[in-house]
């Protein structure tokens, strides 16, 4: 779990000729607000598709009235950050849409007057816990300057907010292979560390220190393609009679992959792993630059400004290959037992267990409360063959050992500030907003929401509703 934070620095005319007209006037003063929509991966989805990672709406900015004859300056902005909480792992690659909306403050007797001024979108890679990333985007004659970052909420840490911090078992140091959990130095990080040298592309681990290979790869570090390793050593794949499997003619015989590509057999045919600068079924397409978009499945292309220099595809979790063309599906092996849900996080497998089961692979049947301790005043509750800890206020997790942060899961709307409280959370609303989560504007000025859209018109389209 964590929070994506967006700081708008300025919104105003971009450089160059053709300065935009001021969005406000002396007759119709207005104010701005912003909406951010986040989607996982590097998808180029339509603007109206769901904000699967989350979304947020800012408070209203100060009222602005155009000065006659003056050029449109940077417009006054709302205070504070836009915060988008995320419950699961931070995906590392994401798409964003930032919309600038204008709210007109003239006496609107009829319906709302609410119009979209600018919409920018982009696709980025971002590690959680890193520094603020600065960005400039242009929409027509407007320019938006902003910074963003993703940060984990305790007890989660790491670039994807998937590693957890735990209180130290010994007062002086962490256990073997465990590091202090910055910035919570009194706690220990519990990362999943594979065997040193285990291929990050072709290997994975379910227990610390191991290296298990994806289909088509072998060797202690999963660096050897199966098709070239069969029978190269006496310990290769063997049968009881011959001691070695000698394959018949296969689709990789004669290596159909051009330009130095390596061939591996698939159940139906073959697959070429191409060197950088080449792609295609047989690595026959060359002279590729990032401008050609060689990275598939949302891979981020780096380098390769001209045909002579190589490019590198940085693949999002769940994909591999020199062009991110291969999907990694380790859940197809059904590693989670007892009906557990398999989650492939890219760098590791996780099983989300059904009630009553636990363990890395949901292998433990938790049939009663015997021998189970709930920390921090929590009580064990059993029922239906399952049991759980009912935690005291302020604590959460399976054993009530995690400090619960109610603000991480329930944000306040319209720029409201969230405070953890012994009874849950409190939203301190920006002026002009009410509700447990600041979701109700007291005086919407006829302008703070989308009307029921006429047929064929979606909320969020840049029409003006009157």
């Amino acid at each position: 779990a964590g929070v994506f934070e967006l700081q708008i620095h300025s919104f105003g005319p971009g450089p160059g000729p053709g300065a935009p007209r001021s969005p406000c006037s002396a007759r119709l003063p207005c104010r701005l607000f912003f909406r951010v929509c986040l989607k996982p991966g590097l998808s180029e989805e339509a603007a109206e598709s769901p904000c699967a990672l989350g979304a947020a709406l800012s408070a209203r900015g100060p009222v602005y009235t155009e000065q006659p004859g003056a050029p449109a300056p940077d417009l006054p902005l709302p205070d504070g950050l836009l915060q988008v909480p995320f419950r699961d792992a931070w995906p590392g690659t994401f798409s964003f849409i930032i919309e600038t909306w204008r709210e007109e403050l003239g006496d609107q007797i009829g319906g709302p007057a609410w119009s979209l001024l600018a919409r920018v979108a982009g696709r980025r890679r971002l590690a959680a816990g890193g520094p603020w990333a600065r960005d400039i985007q242009r929409a027509g004659a407007w320019e938006l300057r902003f910074s963003y970052r993703a940060r984990c909420e305790p007890p989660a840490v790491g670039t994807a907010c998937t590693r957890l911090c735990r209180p130290r078992s010994a007062p002086s140091r962490c256990g073997p292979g465990l590091r202090p959990c910055a910035p919570l130095e009194d706690e220990c990080e519990a990362p999943l560390v594979c065997r040193a040298g285990c291929s990050p592309e072709h290997g994975f681990c379910e227990q610390p220190g191991e290296c298990r290979c994806l289909e088509g790869w072998t060797g202690p570090l999963c660096t050897v393609p199966v098709s070239t390793s069969s029978c190269l050593s006496p310990r290769g794949p063997s049968s009881a009679t011959t001691g070695c499997l000698v394959p018949g003619p296969g689709p990789c015989d004669g290596n159909p992959c051009a330009n130095g590509g390596s061939c591996s057999e698939t159940p139906r045919s073959f697959e070429c792993t191409c060197p950088r600068g080449f792609y295609g079924l047989r690595c026959e397409v060359s002279g590729v630059t990032c401008a050609d978009g060689p990275c598939f499945n949302g891979g981020l292309c780096v380098g390769g400004a001209d045909p002579d220099s190589a490019y590198i595809c940085h693949c999002p979790p769940g994909f591999q290959g020199s062009n991110c063309e291969k999907r990694v599906d380790r859940c197809s092996l059904q590693p989670c037992r007892n009906g557990g849900l398999c989650l492939d996080l890219g760098h590791a497998l996780r099983c989300r267990c059904r009630a009553g089961f636990a363990g890395p692979r949901c292998e433990h049947d938790l049939d009663d409360c015997a021998g189970r301790a709930c920390a921090n005043g929590g009580t064990c509750v059993e029922g239906g063959g399952a049991h759980r800890c009912s935690c005291a206020l302020g604590f959460g997790g399976r054993d009530c050992r995690e400090r619960a942060d109610p603000c991480a899961a329930r944000p306040c709307a319209h720029g409201g500030r969230c405070y953890a409280h012994f009874s849950g959370l409190v939203c301190a609303c920006a002026p002009g907003y009410m509700g447990a989560r600041c979701e109700f504007p007291v005086h919407p000025d006829g302008a703070s929401a989308l009307p029921a859209a006429p047929p064929g018109l979606r909320p969020g389209d840049p029409q003006r509703y009157l």
Epitope: R35, V36, C37, P50, C51, G54, A55, A56, L57, R410, A413, G435, A436, R437, E439, F440, P444, S448, A449, L450, P451, A452, P459, G460
Partner: nanobody, 117 residues
């Protein structure tokens, strides 16, 4: 896409009662924060009462003790029970929904309430 349809408005005498309904479609009302606003002729639209997605409620001072907002998840509707109505309660009443997933607010088309003898 969230659609809101208000009903239940009409003419009522001072001191009388009325119940407004807001039927939502496109998503479950339990996922929304829903409020009633009103706009009297020549005045700005103002909040009357709201119910958050967690069930907590909020009222403006002028209607506390007289109006009650409630939610029926099975019927996917939110209601405003208005008692002890006064002439100053005359207005067009609008249903408003705040959809948390996409941080988008929506309006209904409004229903007229007239309090007059």
């Amino acid at each position: 896409e969230v659609q809101l349809v208000e009903s239940g408005g009409g003419l009522v005498q001072p001191g009388g009662s009325l119940t407004l309904s807001c039927a939502a479609s496109g998503t479950a009302v339990s996922n929304l924060s829903i409020a009633w606003y009103r706009q009297a002729p020549g005045k700005k639209r103002e909040l009357v009462a709201g119910i958050s997605d967690d069930g907590s409620t909020v009222y403006v001072d002028s209607v506390k003790g007289r109006f009650t907002i409630s939610r029926d998840n099975a019927k996917n509707s939110v209601y405003l029970q208005m008692n002890s109505l006064r002439a100053e309660d005359t207005a067009v009443y609008y249903c408003y929904a705040y959809e948390w997933t996409n941080a988008l607010p929506y309006w209904g088309q409004g229903t007229l309430v007239t309090v007059s003898s």
